[in-house]
Amino acid sequence: ELPSPPSVWFEAEFFHHILHWTPIPNQSESTCYEVALLRYGTGRWNSISNCSQALSYDLTAVTLDLYRSNGYRARVRAVDGSRHSNWTVTNTRFSLDEVTLTVGSVKLEIHNGFILGKIQPPRPKMAPANDTYESIFSHFREYEIAIRKVPGNFTFTHKKVKHENFSLLTSGEVGEFCVQVKPSVTSRTNKGMWSKEECVSLTRQYFTVTN
């Protein structure tokens, strides 16, 4: 009998649901993995892939209703010719709570001494038209914003905002300002991921002189 995959787990962002597993020890070139999925409430395991040689599988297309369902469990077993292992099942139920929150983009502009920021929620192609980030997380959206001045590797101001727009009064400071954003939903336990840094340069020309 083949050994079972030591662990199986989901790593998910908004409408990007990837199942991962660790390989069995001493696998051969012909070892592959079978993936099956259980939707809570159906009591039935569905085979998704009979023979995947990768160590991950994109289950987004078959879990599109994740955000409006009771969640899923997945299981994986090793297959080598006619031999197969026992199933290894995910430890936890895969539900909305397991999805890591991200932002789509952060747009920055400068206006009259303010850095104005606009946070764009993620817009994955796979998401059904009615399942936007704002409709699924319709309340208590929050964002942590970290700004640093370049050069320097320190965060010099850090703020939580409760909407997708923010403004920082630069008070005459000039230089390059780099911004990162991390989303959260205060009523939920989902982890958030920091966005990639967006930078904007502020020079004296952006300040309006008033008497």
């Epitope: 010099f156 101001t157 850090h158 703020k159 939580k160 923010f166 403004s167 920082l168 009064l169 630069t170 008070s171 005459g172 400071e173």
Partner: nanobody, 127 residues
Framework: EVQLLESGGGLVQPGGSLRLSCAAS????????VGWFRQAPGKGREFVSA????????YFGDFVEGRFTISRDNSKNTLYLQMNSLRAEDTAVYYC????????????????????WGQGTLVTVSS
């Protein structure tokens, strides 16, 4: 008028930690942005950190590099500065200060934005 009184300074070895406190009395502390400045021997005052009235915004000087944490407890009218991984160059008198206004602004990196000041507490980092 806000009165501010710092405590928690002292002698600490390089790499060590200290927690400074600033107790406020007088006008309502909870409506102010409050912060810490420091003054090393023979140098001018330097911004360390600040925090808005509700704690949702923090500011740090460029030398902090993640070593310090600022927090406040409005129910106790107290401001805190947790300092970790202290270095010899952190030796200074640390002052607590309070400003008015709430806009998210880099003005709070400036000494001139603060109307109320404490007397200071000395932090010495030496082996």
């Amino acid at each position: 008028e806000v009165q501010l009184l710092e405590s928690g300074g002292g002698l600490v070895q390089p790499g060590g930690s200290l927690r400074l406190s600033c107790a406020a009395s007088g006008r309502t502390f909870s409506s102010h942005t409050v912060g810490w400045f420091r003054q090393a021997p023979g140098k001018g005052r330097e911004f360390v950190s600040a925090i808005t009235w509700n704690g949702d915004t923090t500011y740090f000087g460029d030398f902090v590099e993640g070593r310090f944490t600022i927090s406040r407890d409005n129910s106790k009218n107290t401001l805190y500065l947790q300092m970790n991984s202290l270095r010899a160059e952190d030796t200074a008198v640390y002052y607590c200060a309070a400003a008015t206004g709430q806009v998210w602004s880099l003005q709070y990196l400036r000494e001139s934005s603060y109307a109320y000041w404490g007397q200071g507490t000395l932090v010495t980092v030496s082996s």
